[in-house]
Interface confidence: low
């Protein structure tokens, strides 16, 4: 093709090409051609005729005035026609005649102010219709009944007006799925108007200034629809009352989007008519006080989003936000609820009872005082069977004990990113005889005892990055009693003290973070007793991280039991020379960094074992001295390994001798060198 | 190496209840969990739940909860799938599996037990 | 419960061809996502894990990529042997459901 077109399985793609005209020396055979953000002013029918095999064309974001009829017999097996961000502003009867096979069709953000006669008449498998950010100033696109098969239409950001009977009476025969209306300057709902909709699912009013009074009479004109999916973001909505949703009494209502509305009174019963609603998004309000009847009614809600939805007024204390108690008692088959980023004064007894089908809560950074977390604070969570709790972002600073004795379900704990600072005796976990994950990083220091897990042996991942650890080496160690964990991060604690027993018997560990801590001298053969081999018995160990440690020295059995090591992380420390035979046993190996040490010598005799199986490798920024015995069998390898090496040419560079300085490795010349061949 | 190997293939009646069997070899049974997954004639796989065969605990996909018990005999290396108030859709073959050292995979499967329910 | 999307349902290859096929989450399951080959009347076979690791004894034609909620599998350059039906499947939160299939067959 003398084009720039990329062509790839029957798709041609022929977009941003400053193009004037179609090209004709694509394939014949494409299904597929986007002609997008091009210079096209016209699309000449006789262009298309090689063509005929296009199911989807897209013209998009062209200067495009008009389209001739002839254009789609051209192109019988049209499918999808994309038009969007051209210059159409007249549309005939004439215009997609011959689109008669069209599922999709794209108008949206062009110069269409008017829909005259009928053009989608013909468009009898038509499923979207998109006429959005158009000029439009009623939803008038026909004077007959059409679109039977018409699911989605879209007419957001036009100048709509009013909703009448008269216009929407040509989808009688329809089922939409969708009917986006949103961005439109809707301030009239004419009696029968959805009505005149075979059956409509979704209807999408955001950014319309509705306003309370509004609200009211769409969900009269909405009573005995088929209405399951209802959006009102940002339409104004301040308050509600026992009547704003009355009308949606006569539907089976499943979703409803209150969203940004600024939402500030929530009257007791506004909800009640929505016995059927499963998915209700509440996010980013102003509610003051939710009372205690005001979500009566939502019974079958599983997912309710009230994030950002109480927020203080002023930084008086009498404006915090009030939640009654019993509020969320309505919500029984409540799974999902969000409730971050909010202004809430505390967690009452009887905040959360009701909820006996709730699984997953977040309250991360919702309260202006959760300082510490008592015996009481989650006693309304008693008979919820939740799996996942957020409470990060608190300023939780004390956990009492009993605190989580009231979640016997619970599974992943997450107390990360607080101000926690206190000793573990262990009772805080009381009662958490489920939990798989405890998140307790970046707090403000942890003191461990011996018996601060001992009550949750089923916990498999337990993350203490950054928490000022104290006491980690005790013995017997903290983490004896945690058999099944397979993930432990201790990152970041500028730990220097540890026994060679403090992870013994976590013989399931899959994953151990111990980067940015201070841990060099337990390797030192000159430490008080020799090494100490902290790593012994993990043999199921698959990720290793030791980097920014300051090891200057590794003993030579500190790896002898992880058989199953897959990734060994021991960048950023001070590392020289390897004993010969450390990677030995390490016959899994698949990424090993050991960028940014002083590493000279890359020998076989060390090397070998741990390069056999490598997919990964990174040895950055070491000062490699290029000699025949340093170095001539790694080079060798490199040149040879599939293994994948980032950065190879331009940070492996010869430290020494003088001569080779700066010189890249991997170009050292080995043919004078005996005995250097990497395979045998 | 590490095997699963299944009970043979059962034809019940609706209403009755089917004991799937999973025997496991060449690696400490009590170390891995050990899942059930479905998959109807023809159809996509569906995982039903997980047993810890260390200490039995499980965890039951909801839209099974009430119709199965997943069961573990230690001594010899076995674990049970029992569903019971069996319907016709019921019909599928029934696979266990198991969780690899890294927890996020299942690398080992059994060979399948077709269950058939039919009057 | 996080649903698993897959896509196409089916699709028709020739020996040789690259295929990708295409794996969403309804939520966030950040990697913990593998990718599944099973031929009629046999258990499914593992092919990628952790959403690209390839699994021991996978030809190297398979890869895996994506990350939260969107992930592909590629199969470079199709042989014989890879006409079956693959499966995705997350491993983030029980019930750890599967997509539900994408059939590949041969052109």
């Known amino acids: 093709s003398t084009t720039k077109c990329t062509v790839s399985h029957e798709v041609a793609d022929c977009s941003h090409l400053k193009l004037t005209q179609v090209p004709d020396d694509l394939p014949t055979n494409i299904t597929v051609l986007n002609l997008t953000h091009n210079q096209l002013r016209r699309l000449p029918a006789a262009n298309f005729t090689r063509y005929s095999q296009l199911t989807s064309l897209d013209v998009g974001f062209n200067t495009i005035s008009k389209l001739e009829p002839e254009l789609c017999q051209k192109l019988p097996m049209l499918k999808v026609l994309n038009l969007q961000h051209n210059e159409l502003s007249q549309l005939s009867d004439k215009t997609f005649a011959f689109c008669t096979n069209l599922t999709e069709l794209h108008l949206m953000s062009n110069s269409i102010q008017k829909i005259k006669n009928n053009p989608f008449v013909k468009q009898k498998n038509l499923i979207t219709l998109d006429l959005s950010h158009n000029g439009l100033s009623s939803t008038k696109l026909g004077t007959q009944v059409q679109l039977e098969n018409l699911q989605e239409l879209l007419l957001s950001n036009n100048k709509i007006q009013a909703l009448k009977s008269e216009e929407l009476d040509i989808f009688a025969n329809s089922s939409l799925k969708k009917l986006e209306l949103s961005s439109n300057q809707i301030k009239e709902f004419s009696p029968g108007c959805f009505h005149a909709i075979g059956r409509l699912f979704g209807l999408f009013l955001n950014n319309v200034q509705l306003g309370p009074s509004l609200t009211e009479k769409l969900c009269l004109e909405l009573a005995n629809t088929s209405i399951r999916n209802l959006s009102l973001s940002n339409s104004q909505l301040s308050t509600t009352s026992n009547t704003t949703f009355l009308g949606l009494k006569w539907t089976n209502l499943t979703m409803l989007d209150l969203s940004y509305n600024n939402l500030n009174v929530v009257g007791n019963d506004s909800f009640a008519w929505l016995p059927q609603l499963e998915y209700f998004f509440l996010e980013y309000n102003n509610i003051q006080h939710l009372f205690s009847h005001s979500l009566h009614g939502l019974f079958n809600v599983r997912y309710l989003n009230l994030k950002r939805s109480f927020t203080k007024q002023s930084i008086s204390l009498a404006s915090l936000p009030k939640i009654d108690d019993f509020s969320f008692q309505w919500l029984k088959c409540l799974e999902h609820l969000n409730m971050e980023d909010n202004d809430i004064p505390g967690i009452k007894s009887n905040m959360f009872t009701g909820l006996i089908n709730l699984k997953y809560l977040s309250l991360s950074n919702s309260f202006t005082s959760l300082r510490t977390l008592t015996n009481e604070t989650f006693v309304s969570l008693a008979h919820s069977p939740l799996h996942i709790l957020n409470l990060t972002k608190n300023k939780i600073s004390k956990i009492e004990s009993d605190a989580f004795s009231w979640l016997g379900h619970l599974e992943v704990l997450d107390l990360g990113l607080n101000e926690i600072g206190q000793e573990l005796t262990g009772q805080e976990w009381r009662g958490l005889e489920n939990i798989f994950e405890i998140y307790l990083s970046y707090n403000k220091y942890l003191q461990l005892t011996r018996n601060s897990f001992a009550l949750v042996p089923s916990l498999q991942r337990l993350m203490l990055r950054r928490v000022a650890l104290k006491n980690v080496d005790s013995s017997p160690s903290p983490f004896q009693p945690l058999r099944n964990l397979t993930i432990l991060d201790l990152s970041n604690n500028n730990i220097a003290n540890i026994n060679d027993d403090m992870l013994e018997g976590l013989e399931k560990l899959e994953i151990l973070d111990l980067q940015h801590n201070n841990l060099a001298r337990l390797w030192k053969h000159a430490n008080p007793g020799g090494p100490i081999y902290f790593l012994k018995g993990l043999s199921h160990l698959h990720i290793l991280n030791l980097e920014s440690n300051g090891f200057d020295e590794i003993p030579v059995e500190v790896f002898k039991d992880l058989f199953e090591l897959k990734i060994i992380d021991l960048g950023l420390n001070n590392l020289n020379t390897l004993p010969a035979s450390v990677f030995n046993n390490q016959v899994s190996l698949k990424s090993l960094n050991l960028q940014k040490n002083l590493i000279t010598s890359v020998e076989k005799k060390v090397f070998g074992p741990a390069f056999r199986n490598l997919t990964e490798l990174d040895m950055r920024f070491n000062p490699f001295d290029c000699t025949c015995e340093s170095i001539a069998w790694f080079v060798n390898w490199i040149n040879e390994t599939h293994t994948n090496i980032p950065e190879l040419s331009s940070h492996y560079l010869c430290n020494t001798p003088p001569h080779y300085h700066g010189f890249p490795v991997r170009l050292f010349d080995t043919s004078s060198c005996k005995d250097s061949a990497p395979f045998e | 190496q590490v095997q699963l190997v299944q009970s043979g293939a059962e034809v019940k009646k609706p209403g009755a209840s089917v004991k799937v069997s999973c025997k496991a070899s060449g690696y400490t049974f009590t170390t891995y969990w050990i899942h059930w997954v479905r998959q109807a004639p023809g159809q996509g796989l569906e995982w039903m739940g997980e047993?810890?065969?260390?200490?039995?605990?499980?965890n039951y996909n909801e839209k099974f909860k009430t119709r199965v018990t997943m069961t573990r005999d230690t001594s010899i290396s076995t674990a049970y799938m029992e569903l019971s108030r069996l319907r016709s859709d019921d019909t599928a073959v029934y696979y266990c599996?198991?969780?690899?050292?890294?927890?996020?995979?299942?690398?080992?499967w059994g060979q399948g037990t077709l269950v058939t329910v039919s009057s | 419960d996080i649903q698993m999307t897959q896509s196409p349902s089916s699709l028709s290859a020739s020996v040789g061809d690259r295929v990708t096929i295409t794996c969403r989450a309804s939520g966030n399951i950040h990697n913990y996502l593998a990718w599944y080959q099973q031929k009629p009347g046999k258990a499914p076979k593992l092919l990628i894990y952790?959403?690209?690791t390839l699994a021991d004894g996978v030809p190297s034609r398979f890869s895996g990529s994506g990350s939260g909620t969107d992930f592909t599998l590629t199969i470079s350059s199709l042989q014989p042997e890879d006409f079956a039906t693959y499966y995705c499947?997350?491993?983030?939160?029980?019930?750890?459901?599967f997509g539900q299939g994408t059939k590949l067959e041969i052109k």
């Open positions: 499947q997350h491993f983030w939160s029980t019930p750890f459901t």
């Open positions: 047993i810890n065969p260390n200490n039995g605990r499980i």
């Open positions: 599996a198991r969780v690899g050292v890294m927890i996020t995979t299942f690398p080992y």
């Open positions: 952790n959403a690209k």
